[in-house]
Amino acid sequence: TEVKVIQPEKSVSVAAGDSTVLNCTLTSLLPVGPIRWYRGVGQSRQLIYSFTTEHFPRVTNVSDATKRSNLDFSIRISNVTPEDAGTYYCVKFQRGSPDTEIQSGGGTEVYVLAK
């Protein structure tokens, strides 16, 4: 059965300066390959977080993604600014050179409210 990427919230609202959690769970870790978060779609989409590296200053993983059975790939964005508004997608890749996108969540739209 093919892996499914579940983003339960269609949208979240957050006040500027606060933090928000974007939820994402997978139904399987197979086939092996990375999980990444993007804002937007298509060629211009922006990488927000990758579970393969740890250099994303305002974004952290919520659960311990180093657990070998971990299926929770939710992220927390801190100190949200108006520029963070947009639709965020949790995306599962299959390993390769380059990695191949095989499944995306339905997206979670982030609305940023004035403080």
């Epitope: 180093t66 070998r68 390993r95 050179s97």
Partner: antibody, heavy 118, light 107 residues
Amino acid sequence: DVQLVESGGAVVRPGESLRLSCAASGFTFSSYAMSWVRQAPGKGLEWLAGISAGGSDTYYIDSVKGRFTISRDNSENSLYLQMNSLTAEDTAVYYCARETWNHLFDYWGLGTLVTVSS
Amino acid sequence: ALTQPASVSANPGETVKITCSGGDWYSTYYGWYQQKSPGSAPVTVIHSDDKRPSDIPSRFSGSASGSAATLTITGVRVEDEAVYYCAGYDGRTYINTFGAGTTLTVL
């Protein structure tokens, strides 16, 4: 610079216990899963056990399950391997290794020698 | 179990390929580790199939397809003489496995 330094290796008798330590520095220890790997004299590398970054999940090869326990203290940047009921087959150099995101290894310690002999 | 040749040899400047078979493309990631003498610390030359650590020379490369992984050393040098171990992480079983090691001799 990432540094992993093992200690605690010794000569022990069959049936005895030993606790190995691995002191980590140069990276955010609490963000990484860790593993223990050993090499018996004249043999190849053998993975023994792994532990998640938070320490809640542990994994073992069948041959050491129930005898060896991997643990960590993130406040001390330390990894441990408690070894019980040791036999001559456990004689080896024991290495700690930092795991990559997909549970392979990127950095290794220099190793500590455990000799089990009567 | 992961299978790799017991030994390979090459002249300086030649290209060496060491294969590692027995994994499953669907569930196994591969890495390669260099050990220059028994009991000395292994050095990671490739992880995640094809990722080379920043301090490893570019003559080392890795690839994976089907049920096998390959370590390629392009323009081998005398200092590359070592035992090379492949390792796999299996996402089904959560277990790591090493091959028996390949002794590279540079003639």
